[in-house]
Amino acid sequence: ESWEPCVEVVPNITYQCMELKFYKIPDNIPFSTKNLDLSFNPLRHLGSYSFLRFPELQVLDLSRCEIQTIEDGAYQSLSHLSTLILTGNPIQSLALGAFSGLSSLQKLVAVETNLASLENFPIGHLKTLKELNVAHNLIQSFKLPEYFSNLTNLEHLDLSSNKIQNIYCKDLQVLHQMPLSNLSLDLSLNPINFIQPGAFKEIRLHKLTLRSNFDDLNVMKTCIQGLAGLEVHRLVLGEFRNERNLEEFDKSSLEGLCNLTIEEFRLTYLDCYLDNIIDLFNCLANVSSFSLVSVNIKRVEDFSYNFRWQHLELVNCKFEQFPTLELKSLKRLTFTANKGGNAFSEVDLPSLEFLDLSRNGLSFKGCCSQSDFGTTSLKYLDLSFNDVITMSSNFLGLEQLEHLDFQHSNLKQMSQFSVFLSLRNLIYLDISHTHTRVAFNGIFDGLLSLKVLKMAGNSFQENFLPDIFTDLKNLTFLDLSQCQLEQLSPTAFDTLNKLQVLNMSHNNFFSLDTFPYKCLPSLQVLDYSLNHIMTSNNQELQHFPSSLAFLNLTQNDFACTCEHQSFLQWIKDQRQLLVEAERMECATPSDKQGMPVLSLNITCQMNKT
């Protein structure tokens, strides 16, 4: 092909020419190319008009191309380029007009390019620039040059892993002249040991990230004091998993935050084994979102009921026991992948609407009632990937629930009463792989609004699917895969007029019957793959609903013998519906094993006697 040795990803649009030992820009790529990856080629030098042949380019990746010199107008003609990646090039000579002509550039990545200063970086004319990533360089001064006043669209400035030690008032002068209140600034992994008080006074930022910046707690405290006067939508403090400098926090560690205006706060990778953390977070009582990620914490009981947090996130933290959470204003709680407390204890969250308690290995002595959560406003509840959950209440006071996920938790007492009877607003229910054995036809009674039901990996009494879906008149998606099913009631799906997707894969059906699907006028996808289907169980196979677009019968045990000729012919007649038809193979007889069913030509004659 003309573009070889490059790889054509999307014809005329996207080409990957990675690591092909090119010394110059290839000339066999179409003019119309929009995305071009030239990374890991020894280009070394970019002269003027290097990319004249690609006027439509939007994304250009020149990572690790050993580029040392970029001449004036190297990218001239790339007026549509929005992303330029120069990561890992040992640039020594960068002409003043190196980036001229890039009138649409939005993202410039110059990570690890030997950049020693922003002052001499010739990007002041890139008015469309939204994201500038100059991480992993040799920048020592945080002074934002005057030309930043031209970069009125700048939203992300990544200065992480540089050599910045001191931040002075004059460094941010340009932000006073031309406020960039949407700017997110990442200063992580700079060895900061001094921030001049007032440097951030009256400055507004969207996000400020300071992770693994401080050698010890005292430096951190004084630097936080130096942030006084900053108004920031989101502040991220802490460390990285592999970059830990700070010992245990003390209760005054975050005192300086009282002098900032913060909307959202996140703390990462720290140890807070304090007996009383209320003092630690007192200055954050009024933030709307509070997040602890990978923080070892002794007691969360000390969060005050009066804290005005609306969103609390506790992820991958370590607790001595499940925290007693009592917060008046909280609307969203994300408590996931935590270690420690293995038994849920009730929380008092009267404003709560969204609750994610997934992946904690928690056991629930009872579930679920408004008294467990202290709210009647809950709409979203995720209890997936936990331990034993005993269903002892039918969601009294939780009638507003719309989304409920139990997947991969161990549900007990599911077949003793209509657990979901009061959930008339529920739209999404996942009870996949919950050790549920359906032995009670009223299991889904009351779910009048349900659209999605996932119940894969469970089991049914006598491996028979009874009429358990009678209330689910709004169901559009049903997953019954891996349920060891062998038979189903002919009327099992009769009320599911809106059903569009039905997954019956990975069960133990030996025959296919179209009859149960006659009342599914909206059915589009039917998956019967990974069963043991040999034939149909009635002579007269009717047609599937006309709405059906995809029928998956792959990986079954088709019997390619004369007695099943009409069934095999029927399959051929459904050819336009079949998904991955080439994977539909004969299982018997042995001489036809592995042969594609659709290529069979079975001619059978009646023996005349």
């Epitope: 009981e301 005050s304 007693t324 009592e326 009730e346 002595k365 008294s371 209440s393």
Partner: antibody, heavy 118, light 107 residues
């Protein structure tokens, strides 16, 4: 409106078992909350004894753990307290109460006095 | 267990006077402290939850404050019907415990 009503003998002999029942109206005890026993010796303060959760789980004050049992009958919507090997110090007004999601008690029974005496 | 110490044990007050009752916890309990009023031969009645949140129906003269280990219940202008014993209760951890009570008498 939730209402709780204690009942049981007012006099129990030392070393016997004290038995009380709390009848609840206005909320099914098997559908939510935890249901507690609290006592108050004459002229003294309140002591939390233990509870039964709507799921049937129970927990007790460590000081009473060896002597106390709390059970329930959801069909009658009532829960019961048994305190074995009683002595004179167990003489008190016994209250049943419902705890809210926070650890406080908005609903109490009117209390019943149990005297331990021979 | 967390011990709650109330003071004073007894207070004799003139109507319209301001009453202040304190409750001290043996360890920090954030604001997980609740106040009850108990009149003779009646069961306790919840007045204040979480140190400062008045329960609906409770007269506005009752207020609470404090956090950590020191808490206060204030009755701004005492009325005759306020003669009762007042108890604090911590909800920070089990076993739940009550203070010893403060008896308020009308002079």
């Amino acid at each position: 409106q939730v209402q709780l009503q204690e009942s049981g003998p007012g006099l129990v002999k030392p070393s016997d078992t004290l038995s009380l029942t709390c009848a609840v109206s206005g909320f099914p005890i098997g559908q939510g909350y935890s249901w507690h026993w609290i006592r108050q010796p004459p002229g003294k303060g309140l002591e939390w004894m233990g509870y039964i959760h709507y799921s049937g789980y129970t927990d007790f004050n460590p000081s009473l753990k060896t002597r106390i049992t709390i059970s329930r009958d959801t069909s009658k919507n009532q829960f019961s307290l048994k305190l074995s090997s009683v002595t004179a110090v167990d003489t008190a007004v016994y209250y049943c109460a419902r705890k809210d999601s926070g650890n406080y008690f908005p609903y109490w029974g009117q209390g019943t006095l149990v005297t331990v005496s021979s | 267990e967390i011990v709650l110490t109330q003071s004073p044990d007894f207070q004799s007050v003139t109507p319209k006077e301001k009453v202040t009752i304190t409750c001290r916890a043996s360890q920090s309990i954030s604001d997980h402290l609740h106040w009850y009023q108990q009149k003779p031969d009646q069961s306790p009645k919840l007045l204040i939850k979480y140190a400062s949140h008045a329960i609906s129906g409770v007269p506005s003269r009752f207020s609470g404050s404090g956090s950590g280990t020191d808490f206060t219940l204030t009755i701004n202008s005492l009325e005759a019907e306020d003669a009762a014993t007042y108890y604090c209760q911590q909800g920070h951890s089990f076993p739940l415990t009550f203070g010893g009570g403060t008896k308020v008498e009308i002079k």
